[in-house]
């Protein structure tokens, strides 16, 4: 007869490992007992259990409550055992020794491999701002046995760098994703993908990219200067900008307070029926947590009653900004 086993048994941490040992004998042969032991080099044989055809299963104290026979029905020639709740320390070589009658003793070895699935963590980098050079967007770390694979899934252009730290029974892999921040990246997902033989499916952790920026401010509403005449109703100036986070708007008049009746509604400055008192320099101030910008325009309200030959100033606009 001969012993049937596996060269390698693979189990995920916390699961039960079946250690196979089956005697395929000729008819009439019997198995008297099966002895299981750790057979790691340098450790000496550490007994796990003794399976006796007459007296049943005896488990050594070190493995009390952890070694069982597979559930019935059981073949008397089957010396397999279950090792409950596998831990990393269980990884190694095991030996089964089978005493048969009348053929004598047989032995076989197998290697138990305990997979430790990773619990990945994603750490976003510092707040991203337009104008920065190559910047860390996020790092992703996963530790397991064997070493996990860490990759990135994103439509954003960037560079990755990985490093690995080996521990006694596991390895930690860290991958970093670097990019040059651009407003076009706002809202784009950056996903860390961790693969490992102990996982049923890849682990994914997603970070949404946010790049702070503030666009130049400009003012709309003065395109046709001739519309800005005394008595006109519904005149308004609108401040245009874009930003992340969304900017807030504020209107002031450079050469004095805002005239009475002028309404500020966010980015819009609404005028009552125009008078010459509405002439002046108006400043739109745009700001967010990242920066602030100004845009100023000169409003010149025409009075048809006055000298029609009067020279009208062209609309002037200027921009200023500062970074917080």
């Amino acid at each position: 007869g001969e012993l049937e086993t596996s060269d390698v048994v693979t189990v995920v941490l916390g699961q039960d490992a079946k250690l196979p040992c089956f005697y395929r004998g000729d008819s009439g042969e019997q198995v008297g007992q099966v002895a299981w032991a750790r057979a790691d080099a340098g450790e000496g044989a550490q007994e796990l259990a003794l399976l006796h055809s007459k007296y049943g299963l005896h488990v050594s104290p070190a493995y009390e409550g952890r070694v069982e026979q597979p559930p019935p029905p059981r073949n008397p020639l089957d010396g397999s055992v279950l090792l409950r709740n596998a831990v990393q320390a269980d990884e190694g070589e095991y030996e089964c020794r089978v005493s048969t009658f009348p053929a004598g003793s047989f032995q076989a070895r197998l290697r138990l491999r305990v997979l430790v699935p990773p619990l990945p963590s994603l750490n976003p980098g510092p707040a991203l701002e337009e104008g920065q050079g190559l910047t860390l967007a996020a790092s992703c770390t996963a530790e397991g046995s064997p070493a996990p694979s860490v990759t990135w899934d994103t439509e954003v252009k960037g560079t990755t760098s990985s490093r690995s730290f080996k521990h006694s029974r596991s390895a930690a892999v860290t991958s970093e994703f670097h990019l040059v921040p651009s407003r076009s990246m706002n809202g784009q997902p950056l996903t860390c993908v961790v693969s490992h033989p102990g996982l049923l499916q890849d682990q994914r952790i997603t970070h949404i990219l946010h790049v702070s920026f503030l666009a130049e401010a400009s003012v709309r509403g003065l395109e046709d200067q001739n519309l800005w005449h005394v008595g006109r109703e519904g005149a308004m100036l609108k401040c245009l900008s874009e930003g992340q986070p969304p900017p807030s708007y504020n209107w002031t008049r450079l050469d004095g307070p805002l005239p009475s009746g002028v309404r500020v509604d966010g980015d819009t400055l609404g005028f009552p029926p125009l008078t010459t008192e509405h002439s002046g320099i108006y400043v739109c101030h745009v700001s967010n947590e990242f920066s602030s910008r100004d845009s100023q325009v000169t409003v010149d309200v025409l009075d048809p009653q006055e000298d029609s030959g009067k020279q009208v100033d062209l609309v002037s606009a200027s921009h200023h900004h500062h970074h917080h």
Epitope: S184, M185, P245, D267
Partner: antibody, heavy 124, light 112 residues
Framework: QVQLQESGPGLVKPSETLSLTCTVS????????WSWIRQPPGKGLEWIGY???????NYNPSLKSRVTISVDMSKNQFSLRLSSVTAADTAVYYC??????????????????WGRGTLVTVSS | QSVLTQPPSVSAAPGQKVTISCSGS????????VSWYQQFPGTAPKLLIY???KRPSGIPDRFSGSKSGTSATLGITGLQTGDEADYYC????????????FGGGTKLTVLG
């Protein structure tokens, strides 16, 4: 002040595509993220996905294969398309404005403005 | 089954205080800001609390929010019959099914 209004057919046949539009009035669509959220009758809220004014999108993974969100800056509108609908897609669909920013330590994300919602029934 | 767990219902008498819990994990509440929404029957939800504990203008200070670890709480003091509504918590979740997640909602009943 800024207001959102959903529009689109209230009845869609199974296997067809649901199409809705959200019109933003009283303010600009720029600088913000914009989301679609739905609520089946008598049930809770489910986020469908968002679009940034520049066009970048992100969708609920459970709906990703069927969802498209697009934006039309010139019309101050954004739209939802949900393909291959079934009765399970019957819901009130809301459009919402997101405040959405990562401050270097955590996500600041909330829906500060909502449309009134529109009921879409999937039935033959 | 919602990623964020809320009690289906809570109730209290007018004038009393009530709290609504919202329980999550490290991939959502634990690492991100939480917001709360109030919804009356037949109407759209309304932002009640953002950034864990801030109130938008127009929301009375009877409403408060807090966060600790992987749980968030909405508190309402001086309960009024007009507070009877559904309340939802929400936050970003970065895990496998990444996206915005809402709690299942809590129906607040004002007794009497």
């Amino acid at each position: 002040q800024v207001q959102l209004q959903e529009s689109g057919p209230g009845l869609v046949k199974p296997s067809e595509t649901l199409s809705l539009t959200c019109t933003v009035s009283g303010g600009s669509i720029s600088s913000y993220f914009w989301s679609w959220i739905r609520q089946p009758p008598g049930k809770g809220l489910e986020w469908i996905g968002y679009i940034y004014y520049s066009g970048n999108t992100n969708y609920n993974p459970s709906l990703k294969s069927r969802v498209t969100i697009s934006v039309d800056m010139s019309k101050n509108q954004f739209s939802l398309r949900l393909s291959s609908v079934t009765a399970a897609d019957t819901a009130v669909y809301y459009c919402a404005r997101d405040f959405h920013h990562y401050d270097g330590s955590a996500y600041r994300w909330y829906f500060d403005l909502w449309g009134r919602g529109t009921l879409v029934t999937v039935s033959s | 089954q919602s990623v964020l767990t809320q009690p289906p219902s809570v109730s209290a008498a007018p004038g009393q205080k009530v709290t609504i819990s919202c329980s999550g994990s490290s991939s959502n509440i634990g690492n991100n800001y939480v917001s709360w929404y109030q919804q009356f029957p037949g109407t759209a939800p309304k932002l009640l609390i953002y950034d864990n504990n801030k109130r938008p203008s127009g929301i009375p200070d009877r409403f408060s929010g807090s966060k600790s670890g992987t749980s968030a709480t909405l508190g309402i003091t001086g309960l009024q019959t007009g507070d009877e509504a559904d309340y939802y918590c929400g936050t970003w979740d970065s895990s496998l099914n990444a996206g915005w997640v809402f709690g299942g909602g809590t129906k607040l009943t004002v007794l009497g």
